[in-house]
C-alpha cells in the first residue's frame, strides 16, 4: 500500500573539524520510494557539487572537506507524492583549532609612547589569548593590557618593557604559538650631566663636561654663542649608553656654549640642550656702557607666550644676548621637568616674561620687571609644588648650573603693583586668556612637546591680587 | 581634630552684604591654599575662590568676581568671604575647603553656612 | 571652561550590590606629560558635607573602604561601589582639576532598593 514518508532518525546536531569528513543522516520510511532533496541554509545543495557526496538514495549527506564556512542549518525534504513532504533540519557546527591570523611584528617604540602588538586569532571554540615574554608569562597591570582581539597593548613603554614576545590562542581543541618578535625601546636624547658655569679670569684653561643618554646613544655637538666651536679641544667617551663628552677651551672672552645631544628615531632626530655661561671677571665690552638694548623679540620659545612685536630687554652681558637668552628659556625649562596642566602655562608665561623683561626705551633702556603680585600667583597658587620641589632642590645643591636661578625670579625682590602700576609688567597669560595659547616648541626636555591643556578661559574665572597684601 | 568650622551665613536682603568665617584647626593653615565652594538648595557643586597660603594671591570664579573677596588672617587660622552686592543666585551652603597643595583637588570640606539671598 | 557630565542623575541598588557612576568631561583631562588623568571623586551624604573619596582618578584617599574604585582614563572615567553599603547611601560628584576652574558634574544619587 502506498505510505506517505516518514523521517525515523531526524537529524541532530554534527560537530566537525575543519578538513574533516561531516555526515548527516537522514532515514525515510516510505511507500514508494521518496525523493530526497537537501538545503544548507535553505539554499539547495546540488547532487553534482563536489564538496559533498549523497549515498543510499539521498540518505545520507557527507560534506567531503569541512570549511569554516560551511556551518550552518542542514535540512533534508523527502516526498513521494503521497501526503505531504516531511522535513527534519540539524545544525553543523564547524570546530576549529587556534589559528593565528595576524601574528605579531618586530616593533621600535619610543619611551613613553603606546605599543600595540597585533595577535588576531581564528578558531571556535574562540581561544583565549596569552602572552609570553621571554620565557615567562606575561602579567597585565595598569599599562599593559591583553585586548578582546588578542593583541598586547603597552602604555607608556618603558625600557624594561623591551625583549622577545610570542602569542599564544589556545582553545579545547588545541594550542598555537605564534613566532618570537622583538620589541626595541627607543629613548629620546637626555642630558644627565649639563656643563657648568664658570667666571674665570682671561686666558684659563675651562673644561666643560656634559653626559648625556639615550637609545640609541646620542651625539653631542658644542655650540660656542650659537655657532659650532671655532677652537679646544672635545673628548668623548662612550659607557653602558651613556656619552660622557668633555671641552676644554682656553678663554679670551665670554660666551655661551650649549652642549647639544641628538639621536635618530627612524626618519626623526630627538634633541636635548644645556647651555653654560663663561664669564671673565672684571671683563666689559668698552664700546657699550650701558647694560641693553631694547629689540622686538625674535625667538621662538616665547612666541605664544609673550605680545606680538613685543620690546624686550637684551642684556650686553652677554656676548650674543638674543641666542643667550632664549637658550636660557630652554635650559630653565628642562630644569622644571612635568609640570601640572595648570602649572605649566603660567610658568611658561613667568619664565619667558622674566627672562625677556618688557623694555622702556630712552636714554638708558631699562627693563621692567614682573609685578609681584604675579609672580606670587605662579609661586603659591599655580605652580606650588613645583616651585617647593625647585627651592628644595636649590637649597640641597641639586642644581649642577646656577643658570636656573637666573630664570626663575625671587618674587620678594619684585615690585608690587601697588606702589607703582607702571613699575612693573603684569602677566596677561595670568588673566587666563585660552585663545592666546600655544604650545612651546619642544624644549630641552627629552620627551617630545605635549599638549598644553586649556586653562580657564577669562569668561569663567579670574585671577586678581589681593588689596589686603602686605610686603614681605 | 583636622577640621573647618564655617559661620556667618544667615538671610540678606539683595544688595545687601554678608562676611563668612572659616576657623582651621589640626593642620598648617598658613602653609594651605584654601577655596570656598557653594551648593545651591537641591543643586550640585560649583567652585567660588581660591586663596594662597600667605594670602598673597587669589582667583574667582567669573559668577562672584568684583562682588565677592576672599581673605585670609593666618594668626587666627581664619579664612574670610566678603559677599557684597548678594542677589537671588548667591544663595546656597557655603563651604571652606582646604585645597591639596599644587592640586586643584579639595582634601578638606566644613560643613557648610547657609547663606539665604530674599526680600 | 570644561564641563563634567554624570550619569545616571539617580540610581537604586540593593544592598550587597555593585553600583557604577560614570563621568563623562567635555574635553580630555589626561595630561601626556605625567599619564596623570586630573579628575577627583566625591561623596556627599544627607545633611553632611562632601568627603574626598578617589583623585588621580583610581586613587583612595586614606580612609576610604576599598570597596570604593574608580577607573576611566581620558573623557570616560566609572566610580563602581562593589559591594553596597546602607552607609553608602548619598550623592556622588565627579570634578575635574585639569584646568582653572575645576568644576564639578550634577551629582548622582545613590539610593537602595
Known amino acids: 500500500l502506498p505510505k506517505a514518508p516518514v523521517i525515523t532518525t531526524p537529524l541532530e546536531t554534527v560537530d566537525a573539524l575543519v578538513e574533516e569528513v561531516a555526515t548527516f543522516m537522514c532515514a525515510v520510511e516510505s511507500y514508494p520510494q521518496p525523493e530526497i532533496s537537501w538545503t544548507r541554509n535553505k539554499i539547495l545543495i546540488k547532487l553534482f557539487d563536489t564538496r559533498y557526496s549523497i549515498r543510499e538514495n539521498g540518505q545520507l549527506l557527507t560534506i567531503l572537506s569541512v570549511e569554516d564556512s560551511d556551518d550552518g542549518i542542514y535540512c533534508c525534504t523527502a516526498n513521494n507524492g503521497v501526503g505531504g513532504a516531511v522535513e527534519s533540519c540539524g545544525a553543523l557546527q564547524v570546530k576549529m583549532k587556534p589559528k593565528i591570523t595576524r601574528p605579531p611584528i618586530n616593533v621600535k617604540i619610543i619611551e613613553g609612547l603606546k605599543a600595540v602588538l597585533p595577535c588576531t586569532t581564528m578558531g571556535n571554540p574562540k581561544p583565549s589569548v596569552s602572552w609570553i615574554k621571554g620565557d615567562s608569562p606575561l602579567r597585565e597591570n595598569s599599562r599593559i593590557a591583553v585586548l578582546e582581539s588578542g593583541s598586547l597593548r603597552i602604555h607608556n613603554v618603558q625600557k624594561e618593557d623591551a625583549g622577545q614576545y610570542r602569542c599564544v590562542a589556545k582553545n579545547s581543541l588545541g594550542t598555537a604559538y605564534s613566532k618570537v618578535v622583538k620589541l626595541e625601546v627607543e629613548v629620546f636624547a637626555r642630558i644627565l650631566r649639563a656643563p657648568e658655569s664658570h667666571n674665570v679670569t682671561f686666558g684659563s684653561f675651562v673644561t666643560l663636561h656634559c653626559t648625556a643618554t639615550g637609545i640609541p646613544v646620542p651625539t653631542i655637538t658644542w655650540i660656542e654663542n650659537g655657532n659650532a666651536v671655532s677652537s679646544g679641544s672635545i673628548q668623548e667617551s662612550v659607557k653602558d649608553r651613556v656619552i660622557d663628552s668633555r671641552l676644554q677651551l682656553f678663554i679670551t672672552k665670554p660666551g655661551l656654549y650649549t652642549c647639544i645631544a641628538t639621536n635618530k628615531h627612524g626618519e626623526k632626530f630627538s634633541t636635548a640642550k644645556a647651555a653654560a655661561t663663561i664669564s671673565i671677571a672684571e671683563w666689559s665690552k668698552p664700546q657699550k656702557d650701558n647694560k641693553g638694548y631694547c629689540a622686538q623679540y625674535r625667538g621662538e620659545v616665547c612666541n605664544a607666550v609673550l605680545a606680538k612685536d613685543a620690546l624686550v630687554f637684551l642684556n650686553t652681558s652677554y656676548a650674543d644676548p638674543e641666542e643667550a637668552q632664549e637658550l636660557l628659556v630652554h635650559t630653565a625649562w628642562n630644569e622644571l621637568k612635568v609640570v601640572s596642566p595648570v602649572c605649566r602655562p603660567a610658568a611658561e608665561a613667568l619664565l619667558c616674561n622674566h627672562i625677556f623683561q618688557e623694555c622702556s626705551p630712552g636714554v638708558v633702556p631699562t627693563p621692567i620687571p614682573i609685578c609681584r603680585e604675579y609672580c606670587l600667583a605662579v609661586k603659591e597658587l599655580f605652580c606650588a609644588k613645583e616651585w617647593l620641589v625647585m627651592e628644595e632642590k636649590t637649597h640641597r645643591g641639586l642644581y649642577r648650573s646656577e643658570m636656573h636661578l637666573l630664570s626663575v625670579p625671587e618674587c620678594s625682590k619684585l615690585p608690587s603693583m601697588h606702589w607703582d602700576p607702571t613699575a612693573c609688567a603684569r602677566l596677561p597669560h595670568l588673566d587666563y586668556n585660552k585663545e592666546n595659547l600655544k604650545t612651546f616648541p619642544p624644549m630641552t626636555s627629552s620627551k617630545p612637546s605635549v599638549d598644553i591643556p586649556n586653562l580657564p578661559s577669562s569668561s569663567s574665572s579670574s585671577f586678581s591680587v589681593s588689596p589686603t597684601y602686605s610686603m614681605t | 581634630e583636622v577640621q573647618l568650622l564655617e559661620s556667618g551665613g544667615g538671610l540678606v536682603q539683595p544688595g545687601g552684604s554678608l562676611r563668612l568665617s572659616c576657623a582651621a584647626s589640626?593642620?598648617?593653615?598658613?602653609?594651605?591654599?584654601m577655596s570656598w565652594v557653594r551648593q545651591a538648595p537641591g543643586k550640585g557643586l560649583e567652585w567660588v575662590s581660591v586663596i594662597s597660603g600667605s594670602g598673597g594671591s587669589t582667583y574667582y570664579a567669573d559668577s562672584v568676581k568684583g562682588h565677592f573677596t576672599i581673605s585670609r588672617d593666618n594668626s587666627k587660622n581664619t579664612l574670610y568671604l566678603q559677599m557684597n552686592s548678594l542677589r537671588a543666585e548667591d544663595t546656597a551652603v557655603y563651604y571652606c575647603a582646604k585645597k591639596e597643595l599644587g592640586d586643584w583637588y579639595f582634601d578638606l570640606w566644613g560643613r557648610g553656612t547657609l547663606v539665604t539671598v530674599s526680600s | 571652561d570644561i564641563v563634567m557630565t554624570q550619569s545616571p542623575d539617580s540610581l537604586a541598588v540593593s544592598l550587597g550590590e555593585r553600583a557604577t557612576i560614570n563621568c563623562k568631561s567635555s574635553q580630555s583631562v589626561l595630561y601626556s606629560s605625567n599619564n596623570k588623568n586630573y579628575l577627583a571623586w566625591y561623596q556627599q551624604r544627607p545633611g553632611q558635607p562632601p568627603k574626598l573619596l578617589i583623585y588621580w582618578a583610581s586613587t583612595r584617599e586614606s580612609g576610604v573602604p576599598d570597596r570604593f574604585s574608580g577607573s576611566g582614563s581620558g573623557t570616560d572615567f566609572t566610580l563602581t561601589i562593589s559591594s553596597l553599603q546602607a552607609e553608602d547611601v548619598a550623592i556622588y560628584y565627579c570634578?575635574?582639576?585639569?584646568?582653572?576652574?575645576?568644576?564639578f558634574g550634577q551629582g548622582t544619587k545613590v539610593e537602595i532598593k
Open positions: 570634578q575635574q582639576y585639569y584646568s582653572i576652574p575645576p568644576t
Open positions: 589640626g593642620f598648617t593653615f598658613n602653609s594651605s591654599a
